[in-house]
């Protein structure tokens, strides 16, 4: 063991260093003192530290540690925050365009149903947005409300235009008839299935991203314990007390200290890994009816088909409803007039051709790839922080918490620490309450993500087959019944080049009747302006 170098006889270097931490020199001894009151930097001989200095070092050490932790997570935090914002806005844009397409469909095909239809469409898509953002909304309710509201207007304006304007009187009966007579066939059920599945996944995806931010924020702002503060002080500052200003801590010693300090945080690792892998599974399954972009941008077509279905059955429906709603008070007679053979168009849907260019789907996969590079973030934190703070290379001529050593020995260091505090005890304390809470939240979201990613959950509800669709009409290779119909085959190009949209929002949204409104043309929808050079951290 080499003898320690003679301490600075005047404590001059220590004084000048300490002054940078704490202006004023009243706490620094002018010459080395016995230091019998010290609790952390226990001296082997005279020392240039006082109890007050030690306290200041402890505070500084803990602050340093917090800053190191924050800088360690900065890139990851930015990645998730940025993506959560981008995806949330992109989903809003999808909803807005889906609403515009639907309004345009009504304006072009059923002008007599406007502005009422715009109102109902607006209500529906408002609920879609609220649902995605986590509101207490039920998808079946919003689909039912859409069709309940639409049918009276369809009946009074399209099927029976002779009725007076004040049709509120028979609305009640018509709303009931809509469900009882299944006037839209299976379209409401189909839309419920598609919308609920795609929105559920979208909502959980956003929830998961927001929880990711919460996890990083929690660990980012951890307050380290006094025990940890003492360990950090011994590692970073106690050497100064001996006048060893240029000595760096041993790398191995740093790892031991960091593992002790971060024992609670590292417990997140298992759940963090599972979080990223579960999120990847979810993203891999977000296609066809599990892709809200696909579902919502095709909704106008399905709604159009549903109205055509009503029109095809108009003759029988008008007769039935005429009897049923002649006296809107006599609701109880409804079932007596149930039509026997409403026309059922088995081949109601043809599939839209979708050209995927820069879609939300590819952005999601890109995010997952970046997140996977952070899969070991928590287990690697102690090592990361040591590599980003001054440590001696190769563990030679370095500080081990008590003295300058030629080579670091973990066993010697542990023995030397025992009379200070028990490192094992520090680890055994378990994570802080905030860390335990965030682990519980991670467990919960992981459970949700796993549930959503179950292979059996990926099968389109077979009960659609029992309700009038021929087996095969909604097959796996046909984008699950999403898309255009018959003569007006829809071609959705470049399905949501959403980054361009973030830079340039179309002004057409929410403007029923505005001449510049985006309108689905007979044969194609040119989806968005592509500005091309949008700057994004995702690119």
């Amino acid at each position: 063991q080499p003898p320690p170098p003679p301490p600075d006889a005047t404590c001059h270097q220590v004084r000048s260093f300490f002054q940078r931490l704490q202006p004023g020199l009243k706490w620094v001894p002018e010459t080395p003192v016995p230091g019998s009151d010290l609790q952390v930097c226990l001296p082997k001989g005279p020392t240039c530290c006082s109890r007050k200095m030690e306290e200041k070092y402890q505070l500084t050490a803990r602050l340093n540690m917090e800053q190191l932790l924050q800088s360690a997570s900065m890139e990851l935090k930015f990645l998730i925050i940025q993506n959560a914002a981008v995806f949330q806005e992109a989903f809003e844009i999808v909803v807005r365009h889906a609403k515009n397409y639907t309004n345009a469909m009504f304006k072009n095909n059923y002008p007599s149903l406007t502005p009422q239809a715009f109102e109902f469409v607006g209500e529906f898509f408002t609920d879609v947005s609220l649902y995605i953002l986590g509101s207490d909304i039920n998808v079946d309710d919003m689909v039912n409300e859409l069709f309940d509201s639409l049918f009276p207007v369809i009946y009074t304006q399209l099927m029976n235009p002779g009725l007076p304007d004040s049709a509120l009187d028979i609305n009640e009966c018509l709303r009931g008839a809509r469900r009882d007579l299944k006037v839209f066939g299976n379209f409401p059920k189909l839309i419920m299935t598609q919308v609920s599945k795609s929105l559920q996944v979208t909502r959980i995806f956003l929830q998961a991203l927001n929880l990711g931010i919460e996890v990083i924020n929690t660990t980012d702002h951890l307050k380290f314990s006094k025990d940890c503060g003492r360990m950090l002080t011994r590692m970073w500052y106690c050497s100064y007390c001996q006048g060893l200003m240029m000595v760096k801590p041993c790398g191995g010693y740093c790892n031991v200290v960091m593992q002790g300090c971060m024992a609670g945080v590292v417990e997140i690792d298992k759940y963090w890994r599972e979080y990223i892998l579960s999120l990847e599974e979810l993203v891999n399954g977000m296609y066809r009816i599990y892709d809200m972009e696909n579902v919502l941008l095709g909704l106008f077509s399905t709604i159009h088909d549903s109205i055509q279905y009503v029109q095809k059955n108009a003759g029988k429906l008008t007769t039935t409803i005429g009897k049923l709603c002649a006296h809107s008070q006599q609701r109880q007679y409804r079932s007596a007039y149930y039509p026997e053979d409403l026309f059922i168009d088995k081949k109601v849907l043809k599939v839209a051709h979708v050209e995927h260019e820069e879609t939300l789907s590819s952005r999601r996969r890109e995010l997952i790839q970046k997140l996977k590079s952070f899969i070991s973030f928590y287990s690697a934190l102690p090592g990361y922080i040591c590599s980003h703070s001054p440590v001696a290379e190769n563990d030679t001529l370095c500080w081990n918490g008590q003295e300058l050593v030629e080579r670091y020995s973990q066993k010697a260091a542990r023995n030397g620490m025992k009379n200070q505090f028990n490192l094992h005890e520090l680890k055994m304390k378990g994570p802080e309450p905030v860390v335990s809470q965030i682990i519980d939240k991670l467990k919960h979201i992981n459970q949700l993500l796993r549930t959503m990613s179950m292979p059996k959950g990926r099968v389109l509800d077979k009960n659609l087959d029992e309700e009038g669709f021929e087996s095969g009409d909604c097959g796996d290779d046909e984008d699950e019944c999403i898309g255009g119909s018959g003569d007006g085959m829809i071609k959705v190009k470049n399905q949501l080049r959403f980054l361009a949209e973030l830079a340039y929002d179309l002004d057409v949204d929410d403007a029923p009747g505005n001449s510049q409104q985006a309108t689905p043309k007979d044969n194609e929808i040119s989806t968005f302006h592509n500005l091309g050079n949008v700057h994004s951290p995702l690119k």
């Epitope: 502005p115 009422q116 109102e119 609220l130 039920n138 039912n144 409300e145 929410d510």
Partner: antibody
Framework: EVQLLESGGGLVQPGGSLRLSCAAS????????MSWVRQAPGKGLEWVSA????????YYADSVKGRFTISRDNSKNTLYLQMNSLRAEDTAVYYC?????????WGQGTMVTVSS | YELTQPPSASGTPGQRVTISCSGG????????VNWFRQLPGTAPKLLVY???QRPSGVPDRFSGSKSGTSASLAIGGLQSDDEADYYC???????????FGGGTKVTVL
């Protein structure tokens, strides 16, 4: 004939709670979204909360979020508004109305006074 | 209030009175407008829905219209029992809530 009848109003101290009810008749209650709208003395109308036909979806004005809870019992044709942590500014006549975006039928209202 | 109405309007019996309701692109500009009337001490009653539709029982003296971000309610052949407060309402896409005008008190001189 559509009828809506509110009850449950009264005088309550700040921080207190009250539960309003609205009994509906003359229409298929479960087919309609329902709302609560209030009117402070001498003031205009303010939407408070809404609920979908099945009760699966609920909506609140920012001013009451976290304090008020809307619910319904379709078997009893009744709409409810549970009001907690009441404040002086919640003093108003509370109307129940049929609909969520536009309101075609209204009840006569029940007065809620929050005062110490 | 998100929607702006004149606080008062008046006319003599038989005259035509128009009440305006001004909003923005997120409410009137993108959604339909409904009008209510509230007689003193009573509940509001629907007069016009979907900009210009009248429920049965509402006389055709009442008519609604909408243009851009403004709407108006016209009362033709003013009668003494038309004295009431009149409110407009529209859904607001930004607030995700229905918004009301402050009300217009109509006086028959």
């Amino acid at each position: 004939e559509v009828q809506l009848l509110e009850s449950g109003g009264g005088l309550v101290q700040p921080g207190g709670s009250l539960r309003l009810s609205c009994a509906a008749s003359g229409f298929t209650f479960s087919s309609y979204a329902m709302s609560w709208v209030r009117q402070a003395p001498g003031k205009g109308l303010e939407w408070v909360s809404a609920i979908s036909g099945s009760g699966g979806s609920t909506y609140y004005a920012d001013s009451v979020k976290g304090r008020f809870t809307i619910s319904r019992d379709n078997s009893k044709n009744t709409l409810y508004l549970q009001m907690n942590s009441l404040r002086a500014e919640d003093t108003a006549v509370y109307y129940c109305a049929r609909g969520k975006r536009y309101f075609d039928y209204w009840g006569q209202g029940t007065m809620v006074t929050v005062s110490s | 209030y998100e929607l702006t109405q004149p606080p008062s309007a008046s006319g003599t019996p038989g005259q035509r009175v128009t009440i305006s309701c001004s909003g923005g692109s997120s409410n009137i500009g993108s959604n339909t407008v409904n009008w209510f009337r509230q007689l003193p001490g009573t509940a509001p009653k629907l007069l016009v829905y979907f900009n210009n539709q009248r429920p049965s029982g509402v006389p055709d003296r009442f008519s609604g219209s909408k243009s851009g971000t403004s709407a108006s309610l016209a009362i033709g052949g003013l009668q003494s029992d038309d004295e009431a407060d009149y409110y407009c309402v529209a859904w607001d896409d930004s607030l995700n809530a229905p918004v009301f005008g402050g009300g217009t008190k109509v006086t028959v001189l």
